[in-house]
Amino acid sequence: KKVVLGKKGDTVELTCTASQKKSIQFHWKNSNQIKILGNQGSFLTKGPSKLNDRADSRRSLWDQGNFPLIIKNLKIEDSDTYICEVEDQKEEVQLLVFGLTANSDTHLLQGQSLTLTLESPPGSSPSVQCRSPRGKNIQGGKTLSVSQLELQDSGTWTCTVLQNQKKVEFKIDIVVLAFQKASSIVYKKEGEQVEFSFPLAFTVEKLTGSGELWWQAERASSSKSWITFDLKNKEVSVKRVTQDPKLQMGKKLPLHLTLPQALPQYAGSGNLTLALEAKTGKLHQEVNLVVMRATQLQKNLTCEVWGPTSPKLMLSLKLENKEAKVSKREKAVWVLNPEAGMWQCLLSDSGQVLLESNIKVLPTW
């Protein structure tokens, strides 16, 4: 008996071939001997089966001795043995219909788990193997689970169902809802305007939710909410904003915040959270602000940085086009009695300059 695997919702075509290459009498029946369809001369006739409105054939093939049965919009319960009767012969085809669905929504928050459930006909014993967009393979029976979804899990999951040495492939599009970056750091000189951007790693037709930026300044003992906002169909509206600093927010995606000027008291780390409508949990992005200040007080030239810097960052003071006068893995460096000229304060990581501030030292007469 020939076995054919089908996918729920799809169309399947079961073949039936006569030895003569001409249109002759045929009919398809199910295992209960109920007629599905057949022919009357060159016309198609249908029987009283449950498939009535979903069954069809290809009359253009009848003259070739081919009498296919097409079943549209397959259901699990269409799994059955179908019998084609032609030329006093019976051709049997066993159809097994499978369905594979994601547990709830195919749009899941980063860190959530994905469960894929296989619907299969009674008596079948299929195995399932799924391959994630990043090439990770998972195997299972009726259910497959992936915990702690990552951004790289976004995309098309390809799942193969195996039964009776036959296979059927399912493709499921999964969208992991997350920010493009888990964390970002902005380096600014004192007084400069600061731009914070929070691009999303996904695109959806309508995006609705609410968000908040909490800020922990390095100099402050506790964190405070800098801004709260709503998101409606990709339009951003500010609900509440602190007076100091007075942040501005863009009205369109990507989420964009502007701090009028970088000041040492603002240096620190923030956490932007976004709660999406009809989703449990929140999206998070950490943002860090490092502020640099170079000052000259009497005979002391000082360079300082505030904010979350890594211990391997180097802070240097140097006269333009000369070797560094001072270079330390600290958050403040100074030079006493600096010679006249343009001095540079540099914050660097393995030789790569992250932040630079210039200060002119005038000659003393």
Partner: antibody, heavy 119, light 107 residues
């Protein structure tokens, strides 16, 4: 002999409506799926809509929800109701018969009727 | 939806020449391809269906072949009446799609 004769074409303004008819003869009309296919000036053929012998309908994405295909088996006539017409709907519309059902190719075609959408 | 890519878009040949037109489907169409001939101001005429079956009345110089996604129409020896535009059609499902057409002109 299979014959298909389209009518109802003409000039219509954007946003307007038109109803095309196709009178069929020479075959058992009710036993065949029928289609409308169009051809914009100087362009190729584009399948528009089909209706099978049981009355199930199928549409191209470009016309879905704007065009309606129907049939009157007692009059051996196929129809295409076209609403919210656009300039890009300007074309010769052909009525065609399928070899059998909607899973078969089209084997006979009419001579076409011209639809012009312009202000 | 299945896309059909037909090539070439135009072709110049002489009477007696052998010509080949190809169609590539965006997915496997299980041999459900038909070929049509259209002359200016006329409706198309079916030449071949199910890849290689000649429609009654079509001369045997027309032939078709292919499987999977790649299909060809061949005219073994061009006759004056064969200069026309040719289209492929996939009918694997009821949402049928045509190729862009190949205009066959006299060289």
């Amino acid at each position: 002999e299979v014959q298909l004769l389209e009518s109802g074409g003409g000039l219509v303004q954007p946003g307007g409506s038109l109803r095309l008819s196709c009178a069929a003869s020479g075959f058992s009309f009710s036993n065949y799926a029928m289609s409308w296919v169009r051809q914009a000036p100087g362009k190729g053929l584009e399948w528009v809509a089909s209706i099978n012998e049981w009355g199930s309908t199928f549409y191209a994405d470009s016309v879905k929800s704007r065009f309606t295909i129907s049939r009157d088996n007692s009059k051996n006539t196929l129809y295409l109701e076209m609403n919210s017409l656009r300039a890009e709907d300007t074309a010769v519309f052909y009525c065609s018969r399928h070899y059998g059902g909607s899973y078969d190719p089209m084997d006979y075609w009419g001579q076409g009727t011209t639809v012009t959408v312009s202000s | 939806d299945i896309q059909m890519t037909q090539s070439p878009s135009s072709l110049s040949a002489s009477v007696g020449d052998r010509v080949t037109i190809t169609c590539r489907a965006s997915q496997d169409i299980n041999k459900y391809i038909a070929w049509y001939q259209q002359k200016p101001g006329k409706g198309p005429k079916l030449l071949i269906h199910y890849t290689s079956i000649l429609h009654p009345g079509v001369p045997s110089r027309f032939s078709g072949s292919g499987s999977g996604t790649d299909y060809t129409l061949t005219i073994s020896s061009l006759q004056p009446e064969d200069f026309a535009t040719y289209y492929c059609l996939q009918y694997d499902n009821p949402l049928q799609t045509f190729g862009q057409g190949t205009k066959l002109e006299i060289k």
